[in-house]
Every structure is written in structure tokens, then in C-alpha cells.
């Protein structure tokens, strides 16, 4: 049997016997386009494809629609995997989304959505979420029903303002809503009363800008 050498996600990488955390090359079925993604092979059984990470403010997240489409940053550090890849991936089979959060006081929490997918670019990569559990709030900090994705050059929110310009970063803004994990990174002791920080309201409340965030996906049947 010929060994599989292309993997669509980190779950496939894990099942092939690669069980070490790190950056792997992923390729969608029937595609030659490759993306580099960080795979978490330890958390909750492993096989997680990291689609977003914030940890130190080293990467600028105030990017264009195209940059959020194709991805940017460093998969070993802060990065955005890319809306197009995630959209295609999550429309091929059912995925769960886990969002892991860290505050500046040493606390950690997570939100787990049992079904997650992004619509196509034609539908502005609208986010679809179902079935919230976890410790980062009983109510979803990503507005429900899901919104279209907005960036500084693509205003698809429900606000009379331009949320991406006001809050910075690309996100599924409402008007503007209870979260923005792609906001400005603020260091410790400068992270409260922020109008444009890294926000997850139903865990830390308004104006609190988080220390770290990771968004990761995995097939529901893993």
C-alpha cells in the first residue's frame, strides 16, 4: 500500500503516525495548493489544526481581505491560516472548533463548538457555529447567528460604523459584537479599558484584552 504523503488536516497527519507538535504542510483533496499549519498533537487527544494564534503581538493583524483569505504570519508563532483554506476544508466534512484563551492573571479557558464551518468567499466567509460548551462563557462570544467576515477594506458588518477599522483586525463582526480575537495586542497592565483589544466578552467582560488565543479545528469524528 502506497503511503499517503499529502494531508488535508492535522487529524490526517496524526493518524499517519506523526504525533509530534509542529508545522506541517497541508493540501486539500483535488488541489495542488499547499499551506503550512501548526498541528497540536497533544491537546485533547491531538490532531488539531491551528487556524489562529495570538501570543505576543509580533504580527500585525490589521490586514486586507486578500491577506485574511490566503493567510499570514508565522505558523510557529502568531498567524492566521487563511479563510479560503478553512472554508474549503470545513465544507468537505464536519469539524469542531475549539478556542483556547489565556488571560494576564494565569487563567485559561476554552469554548468548544460541536459544528463549525465557513461559507464561501462569495458569501463573505460567514461563520456557522452550533453546540457551545466549555469554560469561557455559557453564551457564545461569537455573535449568533454567524456574521460575514469583515476586514479594513471589506465592510460586511451590521454596524453603521466600520467595525474592522474601529476595532482593528478581520473578524465576524456584528455591530460590533462580543468578541474580536484579531484585535490589537496590548501588554500586561495596559490591557484593560481597551476599545480595540483582543476581546472575548463572556469570559473576561468588556475592555479586557487577552494575553493569548488559539483557534483550532478537528474533524468531529476524530
Amino acid at each position: 500500500k502506497e503511503e499517503q504523503i499529502s494531508f488535508r488536516d492535522c487529524a490526517e497527519v496524526f493518524k499517519s503516525g506523526h504525533t509530534t507538535n509542529g508545522v506541517y504542510t497541508l493540501t486539500l483533496p483535488n488541489s495542488t495548493e499547499e499551506v503550512k499549519a501548526y498541528c497540536d498533537m497533544e491537546a485533547g487527544g491531538g490532531g488539531w489544526t491551528i487556524i489562529q494564534r495570538r501570543e505576543d503581538g509580533s504580527v500585525d493583524f490589521q490586514r486586507t481581505w486578500k491577506e485574511y483569505k490566503v493567510g499570514f504570519g508565522n505558523p510557529s508563532g502568531e498567524y492566521w491560516l487563511g479563510n479560503e483554506f478553512v472554508s474549503q476544508l470545513t465544507n468537505q466534512q464536519r469539524y469542531v472548533l475549539k478556542i483556547h484563551l489565556k488571560d494576564w492573571e494565569g487563567n485559561e479557558a476554552y469554548s468548544l463548538y460541536e459544528h463549525f464551518y465557513l461559507s464561501s468567499e462569495e458569501l463573505n466567509y460567514r461563520i456557522h457555529l452550533k453546540g457551545l460548551t466549555g469554560t469561557a462563557g455559557k453564551i457564545s462570544s461569537i455573535s449568533q447567528p454567524g456574521n460575514d467576515f469583515s476586514t479594513k477594506d471589506a465592510d460586511n458588518d451590521k454596524c453603521i460604523c466600520k467595525c474592522s477599522q474601529m476595532l482593528t483586525g478581520g473578524w465576524w463582526f456584528d455591530a460590533c459584537g462580543p468578541s474580536n480575537l484579531n484585535g490589537m495586542y496590548y501588554p500586561q497592565r495596559q490591557n484593560t479599558n481597551k476599545f480595540n483589544g483582543i476581546k472575548w466578552y463572556y469570559w473576561k467582560g468588556s475592555g479586557y484584552s487577552l494575553k493569548g488565543t488559539t483557534m483550532m479545528i478537528r474533524p468531529a469524528d476524530f
Epitope: 453603521i160 474601529m166 456584528d174 475592555g207
Partner: nanobody
Framework: EVQLVESGGGLVQPGGSLRLSCAAS????????IGWFRQAPGKEREGVSS????????YYADSVKGRFTISRDNSKNTVYLQMNSLRPEDTAVYYC??????????????????????WGQGTLVTVSS
């Protein structure tokens, strides 16, 4: 650094009055809507009153309508809450909070709680005889 500081709380008898102040620093009130909220022991934080940024229009919770008045003095970068005919059920910690102008859904007039990103530390109001 954005800061909101409330003052004016204290102990007052039922039927009495208090005037709360919310002094802002690190930003100018002209570009923000300001809300007053309160939280009684063991209860959720609730909106009391707010004043819009652009036209100065005001909102009041049903429980305080006709008794409380919100106003702003942009030259002093301060918002006030005049509270008259106070009742024991008005006892709570009162907070002021700010939200940038225009962070509103099309067709809506008032801001949800989660849009207020800057908060003061609160001032305690106790209504008791």
C-alpha cells in the same frame, strides 16, 4: 490611558437625592456614548441610563424614569446622573461606562452592554433610613 472615575455616592434616606459624576480622562467624551449601570448584591449588572454621543438623546430604564436625569458637560469631560426620590431598591454600586460613537446596529438606538469597553470602578449608593 483611558479612565473613568465615578463619585458622589453615599448613604441617603428614602426620598432623598444624590448626584453622581463620571469624569473621563484619556479620551474626549464628544466621541463616545456614556452609560450608567448598577449592580445590587447578588444581582446582574443592569442599565440605568445612557446618553448618546451625537445628539445627546437619552435613555432611561423604566424603574428610574421620571426620577433620574442624565446629562453631560463635554467641557469638563464629565457625565452626571441626578437621582431624585431615591428608594431602597436603588441601593447598588453604580458604574459609568463608555462606548465609541456609532458602534450601533442599523436601525437601533442603544448600545448593548458588551459594547461598553471602558468602565469605572463604581460608587456605592445606599438608600436606607
Amino acid at each position: 490611558e483611558v479612565q473613568l472615575v465615578e463619585s458622589g455616592g453615599g448613604l441617603v434616606q428614602p426620598g432623598g437625592s444624590l448626584r453622581l459624576s463620571c469624569a473621563a480622562s484619556g479620551f474626549t467624551l464628544d466621541d463616545y456614548a456614556i452609560g450608567w449601570f448598577r449592580q445590587a448584591p447578588g444581582k446582574e449588572r443592569e442599565g440605568v441610563s445612557s446618553i448618546r454621543d451625537n445628539d445627546g438623546s437619552t435613555y432611561y430604564a423604566d424603574s428610574v424614569k421620571g426620577r433620574f436625569t442624565i446629562s453631560r458637560d463635554n467641557s469638563k469631560n464629565t457625565v452626571y446622573l441626578q437621582m431624585n426620590s431615591l428608594r431602597p431598591e436603588d441601593t447598588a454600586v453604580y458604574y459609568c461606562a463608555a462606548v465609541p460613537a456609532g458602534r450601533l446596529r442599523f436601525g437601533e438606538q442603544w448600545y448593548p452592554l458588551y459594547e461598553y469597553d471602558a468602565w469605572g470602578q463604581g460608587t456605592l449608593v445606599t438608600v436606607s433610613s
